[in-house]
């Protein structure tokens, strides 16, 4: 089952700055990501940002910058202008929509240990990444091995002994995994294209996961919308979702110009517009 993980970080340098990281673990194409605070989307939560994999991002105050980090994860920087720091005990929710298969949502908040109200500001704890742990572990084994061999050779010079029986050390026993929520996410750590067939904004693609992410994914609230995609059903390619055939809605008598592969926009298209809608359905 697909999962959504949410992690909220407070910047150690600026206590008024927060970053929300969200990710989608599972197969499928992401058609839209919405980030809200104060509750889940559609349940009283207030929108902070909406991210489309091809058409860009929209954000509302106090959101400062929303961006795609990888094909399946996003980050949202927030600027807390109030002195009381309302973000400290606020719930942030991320909803990953895959139209028409379904949407998955999960929420998270700032860990209590990083409460800005504490006497001392929280210091970020560096988390050893799996690859670094492996390298360090292997280096340690090699150094130890060399030292041990030198020690034996020196002893052999002073006192002749029978043939040496080398001791075997399992270097694998010294490697460590820093973050292993699931097999799917492990594959995604090393090969972001391995398990997730999604689209992204090439300009902002950053396939490397930042150091210091240690929160495990929370189980997503799956809201099935539309026919459930069976294992044998191929997931829709993003190109077919926003296609030239769409026309992306043109006004009467207008022919849309081509604006890129698989995308057609209006002649008067001015990019994302932050419009407060009248479509608040109650």
């Amino acid at each position: 089952t697909p999962e959504v993980w949410v992690q909220v970080q407070m910047e150690a340098t600026e206590l008024s700055s927060f970053t929300v990281h969200c990710g989608f673990l599972g197969p499928g194409s992401i058609s839209l990501v919405t980030v809200s605070w104060g509750g889940p989307d559609g349940a009283g939560g207030t929108k902070l940002a909406v991210l489309h994999p091809e058409l860009g991002t929209r954000q509302w105050a106090p959101a400062r910058q929303a961006r795609w980090e990888t094909q399946s994860s996003i980050s949202l920087a927030l600027e807390d202008s109030g002195a009381s720091s309302p973000f400290a005990n606020t719930t942030f929710c991320c909803k990953f929509a895959s139209f028409p298969e379904g949407s998955w949502e999960s929420c998270g908040s700032l860990p209590p240990s990083s409460d800005p109200g504490l006497s001392a500001p929280p210091t970020p704890v560096p988390i050893l990444r799996a690859d670094l742990a492996g390298i360090l572990g292997l280096s340690g084994v090699l150094l130890f091995g060399c030292g041990y061999l030198l020690h034996l050779l020196r002893r052999q010079k002073h006192r002749p002994t029978p043939r040496l029986q080398p001791s075997h050390t399992n270097s694998q026993a010294l490697t460590a995994q820093a973050w292993a929520p699931s097999q799917a996410s492990q594959a995604a750590l090393h090969d972001p294209y391995a398990t997730i067939n999604t689209s992204f904004c090439p300009a902002t693609l950053d396939t490397a996961h930042p150091n210091g992410w240690a929160s495990l994914p929370t189980h997503a609230a799956h809201q099935p919308q539309g026919p459930a995609a069976s294992a044998s059903t191929p997931i829709l390619a993003r190109g077919s979702f926003v296609s030239v055939e769409n026309g992306l809605y043109t006004q009467a008598g207008e022919r849309p110009p081509h604006t890129g592969p698989g995308l057609t926009l209006f002649p008067d298209c001015r990019g994302p517009r932050a419009v407060e809608g009248r479509f608040g359905v109650r």
Epitope: S31, L32, T34, S36, D41, G42, A43, G44, G45, T46, K47, V50, H52, L55, G56, R58, W60, K95, A97, F99, P100, S103, Q225, V242, N246, L248, Y249, L265, F266, D268, C269, R270, G271, P272, R273, V275, E276, G277, R278, F279, G280, V281, R282
Partner: nanobody, 120 residues
Framework: EVQLVESGGGLVQPGGSLRLSCAAS????????MGWFRQAPGKGLEGVAH???????RYVESVKGRFTISQDHAKNSLYLQMNSLRAEDTAVYYC??????????????WGQGTMVTVSS
């Protein structure tokens, strides 16, 4: 949670008419478009029509002059009047509530879909 329930689909002969309805309930904050998408058998998704928050309807080229999208705010309902139906209009029609990106309505919530079959 937003609930969108479509109705009005069915079998119709070429040249015939159908009226799709979508009843919306729940709560959506800051959504700014409501519309219809469709998916023909074995084909990709296609935006059919949507209404902006400013009330302006927009249509995909292939349905202009044949389809009309309308809204009843009092009933929290969306409609799609489909006239002069063609075989190529056969698809599952989804009612969506979403966000505008330029002049594109990106679905954030949608219904289960209603099947429209145009055949003689």
């Amino acid at each position: 949670e937003v609930q969108l329930v479509e109705s009005g689909g069915g079998l119709v002969q070429p040249g015939g008419s159908l009226r799709l309805s979508c009843a919306a309930s729940g709560y959506t904050s800051r959504t700014d478009c409501m519309g219809w998408f469709r998916q023909a058998p074995g084909k990709g998704l296609e935006g059919v029509a949507h209404i902006d928050s400013d009330g302006i309807p927009r249509y995909v080229e292939s349905v202009k002059g044949r389809f009309t999208i309308s809204q009843d705010h009092a009933k929290n309902s969306l409609y799609l009047q489909m006239n002069s139906l063609r075989a190529e209009d056969t698809a599952v029609y989804y009612c969506v509530v979403g966000f505008k990106f330029g002049d594109y309505c990106a679905p954030n919530d949608w219904g289960q879909g209603t099947m429209v079959t145009v055949s003689s």
